[in-house]
Interface confidence: medium
Amino acid sequence: MAERAALEELVKLQGERVRGLKQQKASAELIEEEVAKLLKLKAQLGPDESKQKFVLKTPKGTRDYSPRQMAVREKVFDVIIRCFKRHGAEVIDTPVFELKETLMGKYGEDSKLIYDLKDQGGELLSLRYDLTVPFARYLAMNKLTNIKRYHIAKVYRRDNPAMTRGRYREFYQCDFDIAGNFDPMIPDAECLKIMCEILSSLQIGDFLVKVNDRRILDGMFAICGVSDSKFRTICSSVDKLDKVSWEEVKNEMVGEKGLAPEVADRIGDYVQQHGGVSLVEQLLQDPKLSQNKQALEGLGDLKLLFEYLTLFGIDDKISFDLSLARGLDYYTGVIYEAVLLQTPAQAGEEPLGVGSVAAGGRYDGLVGMFDPKGRKVPCVGLSIGVERIFSIVEQRLEALEEKIRTTETQVLVASAQKKLLEERLKLVSELWDAGIKAELLYKKNPKLLNQLQYCEEAGIPLVAIIGEQELKDGVIKLRSVTSREEVDVRREDLVEEIKRRTGQPLCIC
């Protein structure tokens, strides 16, 4: 202990010496030398356990969910799950961690964002980065060639997230995928339909779904003269076109990524286009692009896709956008991304989207990566970016100062006089047994005013009030919290009356 005190004194003295030298404007070499000594002393000192205050917080990029946030989240999940089920999906779950080998080589540059776990008994493990690769592993492992499934679970990314924009290191993904050999573009069109249904149902604002095809991108880059080695990096530049001007993107490609200016110019001609089926038709006439086998396949499929999207009534929400170049290594065909359209104060503040709220595409080769014989199972799917949606919904509710119910309690069992705890307990139990969501205050003799106040705060619509007179008459006073209207209901009719008033089915079968 005395040794530590002596070291602390030395640190203090050396600190003063460094400050003095700085004030005297001593030479940089001398200051550097003395700072090095100070750091050495500090290192010897080490952390003082008694002084180290433990900061109570959640790890970087994570958050707790309050009851209010959970209520929002459950509403959002409910909309999504109902849509997935409406489209005939089954549900699966997979482990939160996978063998490291399973995830390696599937995410390209993003692999550095995978969380590796410390060795647990010989297996090298990683936290899942998304739900798609585990799904592909599941298909290969179970030799499945045909499934329509959804999966809602947390994924983990060692990112530097902007949490204010709804981005985290631990976050939920809601995935829907169709695996199997089917006629072209029918499952792809359904995925886009699902995306539109969900985003419309959530009422989070107007949105646009950008569509492109990996094969068109490959073909376009090939005819423009982009080497395979530069494909990924040029894709990431092009993908910024929804945020910055072509001039800036071009400067990055030429200045930072070493692309020849004439190659960049050719790319610019293509990627500055968006439209509907007419653009697909225009590109099918393009003398260069139509000579590229991959691009031609992609354009043919997109033409078909637009036919189906028109039949599904969502073609006005879709934009064929040649700058959509994002996405993971595993996409092989159609790719799409939904962005919310916002109303910025001035142009130049994120011109169109507030960021992606859903994305997906076709990945026909992923399952084959896990199959010993490389057997392919064509897949197409989508992922809803629920964290961003939660943020948007929360902000909107805050702006509207809307009260969110965090419980589903239908009725509070209350008493108007003292010494009625036993009666309250009996009644609440009857209600629970009948499937009614009910509560009571945990006090022997609560004041009626406090009980009514609790209902208002918690948004409980009804109060069942027991009083001595009511007990004699065999009735319960049922009070509406909002209208304050009271009626006497016979005890045997109470369950039915509560169900009628709260719109609950009369039997819990």
């Epitope: 001007s245 072509w246 001039e247 610019g268 500055q272 393009d286 934009s319």
Partner: antibody, heavy 120, light 107 residues
Framework: QVQLVESGGGLVKPGGSLRLSCAAS????????MTWIRQAPGKGLEWVSY????????NYADSVKGRFTISRDNAKNSLYLQMNSLRDEDTAVYFC?????????????WGQGTLVTVSS | DIQMTQSPSSVSASVGDRVTITCRAS??????LAWYQQKPGRAPKLLIF???SLQSGVPSRFSGSGSGTHFTLTISSLQPEDFATYYC?????????FGQGTKLEIK
């Protein structure tokens, strides 16, 4: 600052030809799609044609297809519209405009226009 | 081709008034819509793009809203320099078409 100046307009007989030019300055010309838009006297606006930045992606309104040709010379920062087989209904003020990617097909800067009169 | 229909074709208003101009598309165009202002003998000037985004340098009294097939341009408090003709234009698919225009006149 961005400037677009059209020239080449004038009086021409039906069936005749005319070549419009647009001189651009104040921005990197080759990085932008350019377009011609016209406005008949006392009437609304009509998108005529556009051309991409470098290897000349072009598109035309049905009303001018096969008769008009859009082109550009990036070295000279110039945009052109070659108009052949002119008709009475081509009489209009022709504007050249630059448009931006984020909102493709939105003219963010326009020239003052040049008047083309087709009349016998 | 996508048809764009503006209403009214002309409107009379006074300085300080709030004015709303409507534009309808013959089919859904999401938010691919722009509004322009044109004064006699001058080139059109871009006011609003992407249905509701204000072009740099345009006063904040101009605002746009709508999506799909129905759009509006609102001038919250008319200024003397706002008397002009206003055009909407769809940018969803070529040929990019304009509305027939709305002439805003002094009452």
């Amino acid at each position: 600052q961005v400037q677009l100046v059209e020239s080449g307009g004038g009086l021409v007989k039906p069936g005749g030809s005319l070549r419009l030019s647009c001189a651009a300055s104040g921005f990197t010309f080759s990085d932008y799609y350019m377009t011609w838009i016209r406005q008949a006297p006392g009437k609304g606006l009509e998108w005529v044609s556009y051309i991409s930045g470098s290897f000349a992606y072009t598109n035309y309104a049905d009303s001018v297809k096969g008769r008009f040709t859009i082109s550009r010379d990036n070295a000279k920062n110039s945009l052109y519209l070659q108009m052949n087989s002119l008709r009475d209904e081509d009489t209009a003020v022709y504007f050249c405009a630059r448009y931006v990617y984020q909102v493709v097909a939105i003219g963010d800067y326009w020239g003052q226009g040049t008047l083309v009169t087709v009349s016998s | 081709d996508i048809q764009m229909t503006q209403s009214p074709s002309s409107v009379s208003a006074s300085v300080g008034d709030r004015v709303t101009i409507t534009c309808r598309a013959s089919q859904g165009i999401s938010s691919w819509l722009a509004w322009y202002q044109q004064k006699p003998g001058r080139a059109p000037k871009l006011l609003i793009f992407a249905a509701s985004s204000l072009q740099s340098g345009v006063p904040s009294r101009f605002s746009g809203s709508g999506s799909g097939t129905h759009f509006t341009l609102t001038i919250s408090s008319l200024q003397p320099e706002d008397f002009a003709t206003y055009y909407c234009q769809q940018a969803k698919s070529f040929p990019y078409t304009f509305g027939q225009g709305t002439k805003l006149e002094i009452k």
